[in-house]
């Protein structure tokens, strides 16, 4: 969490970020709130971005301003108009690519005074494991994949049974780029897996940790996936 | 006024490619995205994707992935779609339509007439 | 993916108030799915009417709005006038990608 405050003549006002990450492709948040004002055009929203030279998005009046904008941010920054009354400067931005990484500003000017914060945004891909049975195979075997990761993560297999043993040895995984030449698919496949026993097959990145359950008995299969992301550092 | 003019109707065989048009004018074309939509009778509109002109991003329906590639010419003020290894399952009328994404709302607004693709040996 | 769901057919009178629903199958429809609402009169005519679930497309007659009842998106047309009958048609957008429904034909 980032909490900034106005250095101004005027008084100054809280404005808080939270680091976040963004999933490439998929439409991305960068949050911001601030000790509202009651007027909507009293309320000035600066989004900035470090080592780029026009803005990327103004909101001021009530409505976008974006003559200054940033090429690179085109048609693709909004915030939450009927939010913003409430203290919600929070940036929407759509299809995140992997060039919107970087450190940005939330500046806010109202009646009461300005005040900004930094909130540091990373880009890459994550998503969620499947695991399954691989009835394929000769032995007893374990297929775990997702489809769409960046950079490229760990896999790491664990067992409920066999707490803290090391899988390396039998387990295998792959990676293959996918057709838009960035993210890649995560295949990994554990051999020699025993029945009723839970697996689990956590892929982790420097911007999300994702596992998936398998629980295997002699009458049904359990699956459970969860997905984290890693720097939700507020400022 | 905002217009959208699509090209007109094709009749291609398969295993063809077609490249058809959607010519943008009254408006700044890089700033709204181009949605591409397919329409067969009985099937309801399918979104394919989208791209935003004077920029490379582009996004597509896994569904289309593979059969469809978007291009954006800001001189001509023109959108493209190109379609490939056609097959009967391609024939369709496809719209273009013009997307606002801004704080006070995300819309299609205006479409354009449709390209009719029929795919016959 | 997503299966977006609206009723096949509704019939109105003049002046009536009628109301189209959209529902999704992965759960409520919420404002992060940008609901729009499309209308679609014959020879491939569409316009935008709805977008960001509650907002006109501009030069969109007052007597259309947009909201979200309970857990579906929803066009209400006050005072329904006989130009109105047509073909509408929701999307919604799933973080990625945009699923239209299969259409209301109003009557």
């Known amino acids: 969490l980032i909490i900034g405050f106005g250095i101004s003549g005027r008084h100054s006002i809280t404005v808080t970020t939270v680091a976040s990450a963004g999933n490439i492709g998929e439409d991305g948040i960068l949050s911001c709130t601030f000790e509202p004002d009651i007027k909507l055009s009293d309320i000035v929203i600066q989004w900035l971005k470090e080592g780029v030279l026009g803005l990327v998005h103004e909101f001021k009046e009530g409505k976008d301003e974006l003559s200054e904008q940033d090429e690179m941010f085109r048609g693709r920054t909004a915030v939450f108009a009927d939010q913003v009354i409430v203290g919600n400067a929070s940036l929407r931005l759509k299809n995140v690519q992997l060039t919107d990484a970087g450190t940005y500003k939330c500046y806010i000017i109202t009646s009461k005074g300005k005040g900004n914060a930094n909130l540091e945004y990373k880009t890459g891909a994550f998503s969620m494991p499947e695991v399954n049975v691989d009835y394929n195979a000769s032995s007893e075997t374990l297929r775990c994949e997702a489809p769409r990761w960046f950079p490229q993560p760990t896999v790491v297999w664990a067992s409920q049974v066999d707490q803290g043993a090391n899988f390396s040895e039998v387990s295998n995984t792959s990676f293959e780029l996918n057709s838009e030449n960035v993210t890649m698919k995560v295949v990994s496949v554990l051999y020699n897996v025993t029945i009723n026993n839970t697996y689990s097959c956590m892929i982790e990145n420097d911007i999300a940790k994702a596992t998936g359950d398998i629980k295997v008995t002699e009458s049904e299969i359990k699956r459970r996936s969860h997905l984290q992301l890693l720097n939700s550092k507020a400022s | 006024q905002v217009q959208l003019q699509q090209s007109g109707a094709e009749l291609m065989k398969p295993g063809a490619s077609v490249k058809m048009s959607c010519k943008a004018t009254g408006y700044t074309f890089s700033s709204y995205w181009i949605e591409w939509v397919k329409q067969r009778p009985g099937h309801g509109l399918e979104w394919i994707g989208e791209?935003?002109?004077?920029?490379?991003?582009?996004t597509y329906n896994a569904k289309f992935k593979v059969k469809a590639t978007f291009t954006a010419d800001t001189s001509s003020n023109t959108a493209y779609m190109q379609l490939s290894s056609l097959t009967s399952e391609d024939s369709a009328v496809y719209f273009c339509?013009?997307?606002?994404?801004?704080?006070?709302?995300?819309?299609?607004?205006?479409w354009g007439q449709g390209t009719s693709l029929t795919v016959s040996s | 993916q997503a299966v977006v769901t609206q009723e096949s057919a509704l019939t109105t009178s003049p002046g009536d108030t009628v109301t189209l629903t959209c529902r999704s199958s992965?759960?409520?429809?919420?404002?992060?799915?940008?609901a729009n609402w499309v209308q679609e009169k014959p020879d491939h005519l569409f316009t935008g009417l709805i977008g960001g679930t509650n907002n006109r497309v501009p030069g969109v007659p007052a007597r259309f709005s947009g909201s979200l009842i309970g857990d579906k998106a929803a066009l209400t047309i006050t005072g329904a006038q006989t130009e109105d009958e047509a073909m509408y048609f929701c999307a919604l957008w799933y973080n990625n990608h945009w699923v239209f429904g299969g259409g209301t034909k109003l009557e």
């Open positions: 339509a013009r997307y606002y994404f801004g704080s006070s709302s995300f819309y299609f607004d205006y």
């Open positions: 791209i935003l002109p004077g920029t490379s991003i582009t």
């Open positions: 992965t759960g409520a429809v919420t404002t992060s799915n940008y």
